[in-house]
Interface confidence: low
């Protein structure tokens, strides 16, 4: 099913279809970041791979900047999202 | 309605440079994550070359066989994506896309590139 | 680099059956926060490609549902539940894990 992809979907629904998008791959950084899904962020190697946006494979920056509440209420949501 | 359209495809020689455009629209542009890929004729997919928005700071990362030679570059007030290319070999021959996106969402129609003497 | 391997490279269909193809990368593309970072993309004879399935089972926007993608750390599938006419074309899977991002050699779909 697509229910939970749909749900952030709706979360973003005042954006458009291409907005949407690049909204859940902004959620999912979030999730990244502050390990909301209880993984631990890959280890900090030369090798490491930490997908901080999906495409994105640098090491943790240094200025990552802290959630709002909002945006940890919708992390909350993320962390429900499992594929299909 | 999302569209990318590039431009500045060609016939080139060997050795010789050229610059693709990807002109932007239907989205917000500056928070886009953006990529190359290129289709040699008759061949796959191979990814080029990716740029960031600026916010998360601008860095672009290359395919190794392009690295050095080509750079890719944007203009957020123009809404355009460019890559230029230098040194061209025979083997940059391809049809060349611009994607959006983290997972190319959305993609150009292509821009013919060839490379010949 | 990490390696895509897709299988078949051809694939004959009947409209209404159902098709699968295969994609094997040389290392798991499943992250230690589960996701698994591998889309399937379909390119339409004359056409640029487009996106299906995004981080290895989500469908992108307007993609139909009979199209579905799952798989384990290294072996990924993309089904089509009933193959329409529109369906063909060449299919090929990508990760996205690290870069450089590496496409697989491409499956190509047509109508028996």
């Known amino acids: 099913s697509v229910s939970e992809i749909q749900l952030m979907h709706n979360l973003g629904k005042h954006l458009n279809s291409m907005e949407r998008v690049e909204w859940l791959r902004k959620k999912l950084q979030d999730v990244h970041n502050f390990v909301a899904l209880g993984a631990p962020l890959a280890p900090r190697d030369a090798g490491s791979q930490r997908p901080r946006k999906k495409e994105d494979n640098v090491l943790v920056e240094s200025h990552e900047k802290s959630l709002g509440e909002a945006d940890k209420a919708d992390v909350n949501v993320l962390t429900k999202a499992k594929s299909q | 309605e999302v569209q990318l359209v590039e431009s500045g495809g060609g016939l080139v020689k060997p050795g010789g440079s050229l610059r693709l455009s990807c002109a932007a629209s239907?989205?917000?542009?500056?928070?886009?994550?953006m990529s190359w890929v290129r289709q040699a004729p008759g061949k796959g997919l191979d990814w080029v070359g990716r740029?960031?928005?600026?916010?998360?700071?601008?860095?672009?990362d290359y395919a190794a066989p392009v690295k050095g030679r080509f750079t890719i570059s944007r203009d957020d007030s123009k809404n355009t994506l460019y890559l230029q290319m230098n040194s061209l070999k025979t083997e940059d021959t391809a049809v060349y896309y611009c994607?959006?996106?983290?997972?190319?969402?959305?993609w150009g129609q292509g821009t013919l590139v060839t490379v010949s003497s | 680099d990490i390696v895509m391997t897709q299988s078949p490279l051809s694939l004959p269909v009947t409209p209404g059956e159902p098709a699968s193809i295969s994609c094997r990368s040389s290392?798991?593309?499943?992250?230690?926060?589960?996701?698994?970072?591998l889309d399937w993309f379909l390119q339409k004879p004359g056409q640029s490609p487009q996106l299906l399935i995004y981080?290895?089972?989500y469908r992108a926007s307007g993609v139909p549902d009979r199209f579905s993608g799952r798989g384990s750390g290294t072996d990924f599938t993309l089904k089509i539940s009933r193959v329409e006419a529109e369906d063909v074309g060449v299919y090929y899977c990508?990760?996205?894990?690290?870069?450089?991002?590496?496409f697989g050699q491409g499956t190509k779909v047509e109508i028996k």
């Open positions: 239907g989205f917000t542009f500056s928070n886009a994550w």
């Open positions: 990508m990760q996205a894990l690290q870069t450089p991002w590496t």
């Open positions: 740029i960031k928005s600026k916010t998360d700071g601008g860095t672009t």
């Open positions: 290392q798991s593309l499943l992250h230690s926060n589960g996701y698994k970072f």
């Open positions: 994607t959006t996106g983290a997972t190319f969402d959305s």
């Open positions: 981080l290895g089972s």
